[in-house]
Amino acid sequence: MFTVLTRQPCEQAGLKALYRTPTIIALVVLLVSIVVLVSITVIQIHKQEVLPPGLKYGIVLDAGSSRTTVYVYQWPAEKENNTGVVSQTFKCSVKGSGISSYGNNPQDVPRAFEECMQKVKGQVPSHLHGSTPIHLGATAGMRLLRLQNETAANEVLESIQSYFKSQPFDFRGAQIISGQEEGVYGWITANYLMGNFLEKNLWHMWVHPHGVETTGALDLGGASTQISFVAGEKMDLNTSDIMQVSLYGYVYTLYTHSFQCYGRNEAEKKFLAMLLQNSPTKNHLTNPCYPRDYSISFTMGHVFDSLCTVDQRPESYNPNDVITFEGTGDPSLCKEKVASIFDFKACHDQETCSFDGVYQPKIKGPFVAFAGFYYTASALNLSGSFSLDTFNSSTWNFCSQNWSQLPLLLPKFDEVYARSYCFSANYIYHLFVNGYKFTEETWPQIHFEKEVGNSSIAWSLGYMLSLTNQIPAESPLIRLPIEPPVFVGTLAFFTAAALLCLAFLAYLCSATRRKRHSEHAFDHAVDSD
C-alpha cells in the first residue's frame, strides 16, 4: 500500500486530473507561450545574422603635410547605421612627401598616388569599385600652401581631381579641410572606435551608454596640432572653438582648436629659427635638442621658406645660404629653449587660456594622444598611460644619448625622425603641461595610442563616417525585425500568460496532492485496524 507514495506528487496527482479540459488548455497555452517567447527573442537577437552580410567599402586619402596615407574601410552593408561596425582593412603610405610639396609641379602628384591606388584596387572587390566612395582630405600643409599661393594649391587639387577620374571608384572630391574639422573628425574617430557613442542593450537596440564618458582627442600632425574634448559647464559659448555636435540624437558640446604651425615639423622649424635669431654666429650653431656627435646642414630656405617662420627671417636673408646645427644633447637646455616657441605670456596667467592667447576651457576626462604624439612616446619606449614623472625621466634619458646610441634605442631608425625625438618630447611636455594645463594628477589620463583594434586613430575615419552619413544626427537606431513597442507588448503578454498557466497548474497539483494525502491517511487507518 505504501509503495504508491514513491511516485512524484504531480504524477500521483493524477491521471484523472490530467484529462480535465482546463488542465489541457493551461498546458497548451503554457507551451505556446514558451515557444512564442523563445522565438521572438531569438528572432529579435539573431535576425540580422540570418542574411549573409554583404560588405561595403569606403576609401579616404589623408593628405597630410609630410605624407599622404590611404585608408580602406569596410562595414557590413545591412548594418550601415550601426555603430562600431566600420573597420579599417588596409592602409598604404604614398611614397614621397605631402601633396603641398607639389606646388611647383602639380602634374607629378598622380604618379605618386598610383602605387597605393593599385594596391587599393586589390583590396576592394572589383564589382564594388564603382560604388565605393573615395574622399581626399588635405590638412595643414595645404592650408599653408593655400595661404601662401592659392593658385598652386588649386592646381594641386585639380591634378588630383583629374587623376581620380581615371580610377574605377566613386570619387567624391578633394577638399582642404579646416583645422576645426580635423579636430572634430579625430574626436569622432577616437570615440567611435572606443564604443563611446552607442551600445547594444538586452534587446539588441542601440542606446546611449549610461555614464560613459567621452574621450578627448590630441592629434599631432606635421604642420598643425589639434585638441578636442567635451568640456565642463563653465564655458565661453561665444568662441568659435565651441561646437555643438549631434550624433545619434545626442548633443555633445565640444571644444576643439587647431594650432596652425604647431605640428611637429613646423614647430621644429620655429625652434631652429629661434636658435638662429638668438645666436651670435649665423652659419654654425649649436642645438641642445639634437644628439651629441650629430650635425646637419640646412639651407636658410629649408627653415624660412615656410609661412610659419617667414616673420623670423634674418635681415640679410638668402634662401641658399647654408647653416650647420651641431647637436649638444643637453636635456635641461633643450627643455628651456623649446618653451620659447610658445607664447605663454599672452595668456596673462588666465586659467582658461592655453598659449598664444587662445581660449581653452579646463581640461576634463580621459584623453587619447595619437599620431605624432604616439610616435614620440613610442620612441621613448612608452605607450598607453604613464605618469608625468615617467615621461620626464624617459625624455631626459633619451636627450642625454649621443648619436651613435640612438640606433640601439630605436627599433625603426630613421635619421630625420631620430634626430628630432628629443625636441618632440620637450615640445609635448610644454604643450601639454604649460599649454593645455595637464598636471601630475591629470597626465595619467592621457593614453598614447596608435590604434584601436586594427583601426588607426586618425581624423580620416570620422571624416568618412560623416561624409557617408554613417553617423546620423538623429537617433535612427537599428531597424529591428519586430518594432520595440510590439516586441515589448508581445513579450509582456506571453510572459503573463505563461505565469498564469504555471500558477493554475501549480494550484491543480497542490489541490490534487492534498486530496490524495487525505485518502492515504484514511487507508492507513483502516490497515492498522
Partner: antibody, heavy 120, light 112 residues
C-alpha cells in the same frame, strides 16, 4: 595631329585569344588615357577598359574583368588589347581611342577600328 | 553603373530642318570638380565615331557650329540647327563622370 593606327582584321576560333594593337603618333603618348571600345554588328558602343601608359596599370569594366588585358609600350607608343576565351558574341569592331586632357577617358581621337570575327 | 538612355532611337529628318536628340542618365553627372562630363559622338556609316561635344556644351575642334549641346544634371540635348546630308549617321551620348564610362544606345538620324 594625333593619329591612332590599329592592326588588321582577325578571324579567331571560340576559346582562343586575340591581341589588337594601336600605334599612336603626334603628341605625347605616356600621359594620356587610351581606351578600348567595342561595337558588335548593328549595336551600340561598349567601353572595355583603358590604360594610362605612364602608370602602366589598366582599369577594366566589370563585364570584361579577368578576360581582357590592356598594356602599353611607351618606347613604341603602342597600346595593346588582348581578349581571351573568345566566344561568338565577341564578334565586333574593336576601337582604341585617346583622350586629349590628362587622365580622363574622354575619347577625343579614335583609331580606324579592327574587326574581330569569332567563328568555328 | 550609370545607365544612359536616348530618345528617339530613330530620327527621320528633312534637310535644312532642325533636329534634337535627348539623352538621360540614371544619376547626376556632376563630377566632384563641378564639371559635367557628358560627351556626344557622331558615327557616320562605315566610319569610326568622332567626338562632337564635350562637357555638355563645348564643341570639339572642327565641329560645325550647327551642332550644340545643352542640359544639366541628368537631362541633356544635342541640337542640329539645320540638318545637312553629311549629318546622317548614329549619334551616341557618353558619360565620363562616374565609373565606368557608359554610352547611350544611339540615335539613328536619316533623311526623310
Amino acid at each position: 595631329e594625333v593619329q591612332l593606327v590599329q592592326s588588321g582584321a582577325e578571324v579567331k576560333k571560340p576559346g582562343s585569344s586575340v591581341k589588337v594593337s594601336c600605334k599612336a603618333s603626334g603628341g605625347t603618348f605616356s600621359s594620356y588615357a587610351i581606351s578600348w571600345v567595342r561595337q558588335a554588328p548593328g549595336q551600340g558602343l561598349e567601353w572595355m577598359g583603358g590604360i594610362i601608359p605612364i602608370f602602366g596599370t589598366a582599369n577594366y569594366a566589370q563585364k570584361f574583368q579577368g578576360r581582357v588585358t590592356i598594356t602599353a609600350d611607351e618606347s613604341t607608343s603602342t597600346a595593346y588589347m588582348e581578349l581571351s576565351s573568345l566566344r561568338s558574341e565577341d564578334t565586333a569592331v574593336y576601337y582604341c581611342a585617346r583622350g586629349a586632357s590628362g587622365y580622363d577617358w574622354s575619347l577625343d581621337y579614335w583609331g580606324q577600328g579592327t574587326l574581330v570575327t569569332v567563328s568555328s | 553603373k550609370i545607365v544612359m538612355t536616348q530618345s528617339p532611337l530613330s530620327l527621320p529628318v528633312t534637310l535644312g530642318q532642325p533636329a534634337s536628340i535627348s539623352c538621360r542618365s540614371s544619376q547626376s553627372l556632376v563630377y566632384s570638380d563641378g564639371n559635367t562630363y557628358l560627351n556626344w559622338f557622331q558615327q557616320r556609316p562605315g566610319q569610326s565615331p568622332r567626338r562632337l561635344i564635350y562637357k555638355v556644351s563645348n564643341r570639339h575642334s572642327g565641329v560645325p557650329d550647327r551642332f550644340s549641346g545643352s542640359g544639366s544634371g541628368t537631362d541633356f540635348t544635342l541640337k542640329i540647327s539645320r540638318v545637312e546630308a553629311e549629318d546622317v549617321g548614329v549619334y551616341f551620348c557618353m558619360q565620363g563622370s562616374r565609373w565606368p564610362p557608359t554610352f547611350g544606345p544611339g540615335t539613328k538620324v536619316e533623311i526623310k
